[in-house]
Interface confidence: medium
């Protein structure tokens, strides 16, 4: 079989957007199945049609309606003949058009008066491609060969740049790159103090506008009163925008403020945020816990706990906890140093403990008191000890 591509030279140059119809002539075969191949891959296209010229002469068509750069390449047709594949000579399809940008100027953020570079590259065919730079609506300099790098000594306000690529087919304009000025960041906001304990506090905040320069760190300043002495200043890398303040004094009024910094410098401080650390839980356990059996039940008594340190604050109610070996247990809150216990089984041993609480929590438990089911009364002692 004789295969040849008709009506096409070895190199075919077409303008972008134009149609191309490749014709493949097959002679010496009665019923060829023509396949079109581009750069080694079979072209899947229902536009492949066949016209019989005579019994042993066929023409196959490959129609490309509107060529673009991706259609450029090496085309050939092939037929199966007696188990062997016969291929035609190839046609190199070149698609010409206005320049195509491979690199366009990117948006930048720079410090005032700092030098920077912008890049632009465009390709044909046809070559050569020349680049012209624009600053706003003003052309900068003359044409330069592609690729081109524009060196700018600095700007004092936001400025727009673009490039224009020229070849014999015309010109193409790139995207417009905006070069923004970097600035100091804005103050942080939404500052919240969470997870307060007697000596620690967690702080979180939202960063203000970064001034188009990456935020590098934030500073948390803590004082014991607004305008008072600085207690501590913590510099934290960001993100995340959080900080843990340690080694604070319990039950103390503090204020904190936050600022963040980028490469140009720090933001203003945000407003002061007051907070108070929690006090200490009571340090002492109630002493001399004892029981008095009465006809109506069981009365428990203990000595009043006196605050050891002012940081404990006022001592509040006492908490009484009792348990029996049958699994019964309960807790009750008592204002004074005396409690009347009900709802327990006198036939079972009873273990009682008491602690004093304040706003922070309960202090240590007292020594457990065991009230034996055989005893008339109980006293403080180790578990399961009998009292008379």
């Amino acid at each position: 079989a004789g295969l040849k591509l008709m009506g096409a030279p070895v190199k075919l140059t077409v303008s972008q957007g134009q149609p191309v119809k490749l014709n493949c002539s097959v002679e010496g075969m009665e019923e060829p199945d023509i396949q079109w191949v581009k750069d080694g891959a079979v072209v899947q296209n229902l536009d492949q049609l066949y016209i019989p010229v005579s019994e042993q002469h066929w023409i196959g068509f490959l129609s490309l309606k509107s060529v673009e750069r991706s259609d450029a390449g090496r085309y050939w047709c092939q037929v199966e003949d007696g188990g062997e594949t016969e291929i035609s000579q190839p046609v190199w399809l070149t698609v010409e058009g206005v320049p195509f940008f491979t690199v366009e100027p990117k948006d930048l953020a720079v410090p005032p008066n700092a030098p920077f570079q912008l890049s632009c590259e465009a390709v044909g065919p046809p070559e050569p491609v020349t680049i012209v730079w624009w600053r706003g609506t003003t052309k900068i300099g003359g044409p330069a060969p592609s690729p081109s790098v524009l060196n700018v000594t600095g700007v004092t306000q936001s400025t727009m740049f673009s490039c224009e690529a020229h070849n014999l087919k015309g010109l193409a304009s790139s995207r417009t790159a905006t070069v923004h000025l970097q600035a100091l960041p804005a103050a942080p906001f939404n500052i919240t103090v969470t997870k307060l304990s007697s000596s620690n506090a967690s702080v979180a905040w939202m960063p203000g506008a970064d001034g188009r320069a990456l935020l590098q760190s934030c500073t948390v300043q803590v004082t014991q009163a607004p305008g008072g002495w600085e207690v501590l200043a913590v510099v934290v890398p960001v993100p995340p925008f959080t900080c843990l303040l340690r080694d604070l004094v319990p039950a103390t009024n503090y204020s904190l403020r936050v600022r963040c910094a980028n490469a140009l410098g720090p933001s203003p401080y945000a407003d002061w945020v007051p907070f108070q650390t929690k006090g200490l839980a009571p340090a002492s356990a109630p002493q001399n816990l004892h029981a008095i059996r009465t006809d109506s039940g069981l009365i428990l008594e203990w000595e009043e706990v006196i605050p050891e340190a002012p940081l404990e604050g006022p001592l509040g109610p006492y908490k009484l906890s009792w348990v029996q070996d049958n699994g019964t247990q309960d807790e009750l809150t008592v204002e004074g140093t005396r409690a009347n216990l009900t709802g327990w089984d006198p036939q079972k041993d009873l273990i009682v403990r008491v602690c004093v609480s304040n706003a922070v929590g309960c202090g240590p438990w007292s020594q457990p008191l065991v009230v034996s089911s055989h005893d008339r009364a109980g006293q403080q002692g180790p578990p399961h000890s009998r009292t008379s």
Partner: antibody, heavy 125, light 108 residues
Framework: EVQLVQSGADVKKPGASLTISCQAS????????ISWVRQKPGKGLEWMGR????????YYGPSFQGHVTISADRSTATAYLQWRSLEASDTAMYYC??????????????????WGPGTLVTVSS | SYELTQPPSVSVSPGQTARITCSGD??????AYWYQQKSGQAPVLVIY???KRASGIPERFSGSSSGTMATLTISGAQVEDEADYYC???????????FGGGTKLTVL
């Protein structure tokens, strides 16, 4: 004169198999591809698929891939459309079409110039 | 799967110009074809390769294509032009054909 003669109307139950045919005359069968087009009652045209002149290549529309089989017999110049298991939604008119034609100049291809009269397939229980 | 979109109906008075559009993402690269189908008949090719008139089709039928839109224009529509019109093209990968949903042309 180019003619595409299609088999007669058919009524089938869901799950049944069916083959309809399209016999070409007035031209050399192996010169052109054959396509099948479906038209449900009161609805538009749907491209089902196409078979090459020799039966060596078939293309199917995404909705029909795996549901129908297109084949051809060169010796009788006949193209076929086959179902293994019909569904009620297959009720439609089915046209066979010659894909590709010639203008008076003899070199410009045209699509779907010659259509068969259609075969009405009804699938009902 | 690839779709071609047509308006369901277009109405014109006799002698007016009717325009039927067909939109599809691959139409910048793939040709559009137009078919006319009258009630109870098989379709007839009207336009091929965007703008070429098929043999036997009156000159008042013309086709054009721009970007993702193909248009069938009937200049001076006649009562006998009342029919369903379908655009046809092939998928972006070139491996299957697609018809538009069809447009019912009414010439009042």
């Amino acid at each position: 004169e180019v003619q595409l003669v299609q088999s007669g109307a058919d009524v089938k139950k869901p799950g049944a198999s069916l083959t309809i045919s399209c016999q070409a005359s007035g031209y050399t069968f192996t010169d052109y591809w054959i396509s099948w087009v479906r038209q449900k009652p009161g609805k538009g045209l749907e491209w089902m698929g196409r078979i090459s002149r020799h039966g060596s290549q078939t293309y199917y529309g995404p909705s029909f891939q795996g549901h129908v089989t297109i084949s051809a017999d060169r010796s009788t110049a006949t193209a076929y459309l086959q179902w293994r298991s019909l569904e009620a939604s297959d009720t439609a008119m089915y046209y066979c079409v010659r894909a590709g034609g010639q203008t008076s100049g003899g070199t410009i291809p045209e699509y779907y110039q010659h259509w068969g009269p259609g075969t009405l397939v009804t699938v009902s229980s | 799967s690839y779709e071609l979109t047509q308006p369901p109906s277009v109405s014109v008075s006799p002698g007016q110009t009717a325009r039927i559009t067909c939109s599809g993402d691959a139409l910048p690269k793939k040709y559009a074809y137009w078919y006319q189908q009258k009630s109870g008949q098989a379709p007839v090719l009207v336009i091929y390769e965007d703008h070429k008139r098929a043999s036997g089709i009156p000159e008042r039928f013309s086709g054009s294509s721009s970007g993702t839109m193909a248009t069938l224009t009937i200049s001076g529509a006649q009562v006998e032009d009342e029919a369903d019109y379908y655009c046809y093209s092939i998928s972006p990968a070139g491996n299957y054909g697609v018809f538009g949903g069809g447009t019912k042309l009414t010439v009042l």
